[in-house]
């Protein structure tokens, strides 16, 4: 049944979205939308009246602040607004995602899992170096200035690489070579300066002054999310707690439902642009 507007509401210049309401079309005002707006000395025919001049001042339009989510574009209609949604989204405000993991929405090697709540059809777990709801944004890890002593940082995608200034060495250029000249650390260890005496920073599984002694690889608690660590001849193995997976139990199998809606970049087809 058609809505019954406020009694006397102008059928030509007014409309309603709820019973008993009378909302005016552009250029008309008054409780029943029967008063034409004077535009002679006013900048805008829409909006609340100015207390000093009686003129109407610009008010918020239905598209102000863009009510359309997920990259939808807003256009004003005589009665309200309309959202044009990107591929994969629908709803009054493009708030519903039609994309699922089957569409391959996670880029750059992101792991896709089904969302835990109905509003979230999927969630992307991004690999190191990528972020965004679809893992579409590369993280600028070099902006954190991880290379010490003025070293140059290169983001290789799968890892970082530091190129060191003269007199420095090590994976992060953290070692002053003056102290370590002629010194060597065994088993992939790196030499660290320290008040005239050298010290070795040992690779996983080794310890001692020169990294010649076998160390417990589980001592550093490498297994995340409560995973149990087991040492064996070739290193360590993580036995993950229920709900987690990965070499270090770093990935949730069933992550908590996220309220933030994933945004599929417009025009992108499912696929994985390799780095």
């Amino acid at each position: 049944a058609p809505l019954v507007c406020r009694a006397g509401c102008s059928p030509e210049h007014g409309f309603c979205e709820q019973p008993g309401e009378c909302r005016c079309l552009e250029g008309w005002t008054g409780p029943l939308c029967t008063v034409p707006v004077s535009t002679s000395s006013c900048l805008s025919p829409r909006g609340p009246s100015s207390a000093t001049t009686g003129c109407l001042v610009p008010g918020p339009g239905p598209c102000d602040g863009n009510p359309c989510a997920n990259g939808g574009s807003c256009s004003e209609t005589p009665r309200s607004f309309e959202c044009t949604c990107p591929r994969g989204f629908y709803g009054l405000r493009c708030e519903v995602s039609g994309v699922t993991c089957a569409d391959g929405p996670c880029f750059n090697g992101g792991l896709c899992v089904g969302g835990a709540d109905p509003d979230s059809a999927y969630i992307c777990h991004c690999p190191p170096g990528f972020q965004g709801s679809n893992c579409e944004k590369r993280v600028d890890r070099c902006s954190l200035q991880p290379c010490r002593n003025g070293g140059l940082c290169l983001d290789l995608g799968h890892a970082l690489r530091c190129r060191c200034r003269a007199g420095f060495a090590g994976p992060r250029c953290e070692h002053d070579l003056d102290d370590c000249a002629g010194r060597a650390c065994a088993n992939g260890g790196t030499c660290v300066e320290g008040g005239g005496a050298h010290r070795c920073s040992c690779a996983l599984g080794f310890g001692g002054r020169d990294c010649r002694e076998r160390a417990d690889p589980c001592a550093a608690r490498p297994c995340a999310h409560g995973g149990r660590c087991y040492a064996h001849f070739s290193g360590l193995v993580c036995a993950c707690a229920p709900g987690y997976m990965g070499a270090r139990c770093e990935f949730p199998v069933h992550p908590d439902g996220a309220s933030a809606l994933p945004a599929a970049p417009p025009g992108l087809r499912p696929g994985d642009p390799q780095r």
Epitope: P146, H158, A159, F168, P171, S234
Partner: antibody, heavy 128, light 112 residues
């Protein structure tokens, strides 16, 4: 004792395919890249490809793309698949480890840029 | 991709003498240079990395220096066991996003 051992080499016909295997022992396979380097008789070493064990990222020389594929097949083994072999591919193929280093709170692992452990190599001869 | 050029291709010296090998990179690699020793029938063995940091077990008769594009490996108090071919190596990262490794052509050291 840290060790790499290659296998799968031998005499093959031109145009054939071959899969070489590298088995590691005595060290933690993670936080390392396992790489393949070849050396033709009387020539210098030539890098082919690597695979970073932590996330499976593979990277290869521009000339090797398409014909050479590196894969991690288990927690202690990697393979190199070669297709369309020619006489120019005759060489000793080495498996080599390039270490990566991790730091607590650091944003990523850090590549070392060198090879600190090599296997003895496996000879591949391409001839009809 | 980067090009590593080694000189000389071959050098001869007497026991107890000194040998100097040069390596030139086609672009600035800071200190990202490694040196390897290879004997016939064996794989290359890492001698030093970061231009001058000796690997464990390598005698201090071996020393490295250089920065940027010019690097040097010096072997002093030469021994018969030092007879081998020596290679320099660096890694590269191109603007196209490709990462890789490049070796020099090698220098054969003959000990008299």
């Amino acid at each position: 004792q840290e060790q790499l051992v290659e296998s799968g080499g031998g005499l093959v016909q031109p145009g054939a395919s071959l899969t070489l295997t590298c088995k590691a022992s005595g060290f933690d396979f993670t936080s390392n890249a396992m790489c393949w380097v070849r050396q033709a008789p009387g020539k210098g070493p030539e890098w082919i490809a690597c695979i970073y064990n932590d996330d499976g990222s593979a990277y290869s020389a521009s000339w090797a793309k398409g014909r050479f594929t590196v894969s991690k097949t288990s927690s202690t083994a990697v393979t190199l698949q070669v297709t369309g072999l020619t006489a120019a591919d005759t060489a000793t193929y080495f498996c080599a480890r390039s270490p990566y280093y991790t730091y607590g709170g650091a944003p990523s692992a850090y590549a070392s840029g060198y090879f600190n452990l090599w296997g003895p190599g496996t000879l591949v001869t391409v001839s009809s | 991709d980067i090009v590593m050029t080694q000189t000389p291709a071959s050098v001869e010296a007497a026991v107890g003498g000194t040998v100097t090998i040069k390596c030139q990179a086609s672009e600035n690699i800071y200190n990202s240079l490694a040196w390897y020793q290879q004997k016939p029938g064996q794989p290359p063995k890492l001698l030093m990395h970061d231009a001058s940091v000796l690997t464990s077990g390598v005698p201090s008769r071996f020393s490295g220096s250089g920065y940027g594009t010019e690097f040097t490996l010096t072997i002093s108090d030469l021994e018969c066991a030092d007879a081998a071919t020596y290679y320099c190596q660096s890694d590269y990262y191109s603007t196209g996003g490709s990462y890789g490794f490049a070796f020099g052509g090698g220098t054969e050291v003959v000990v008299k």
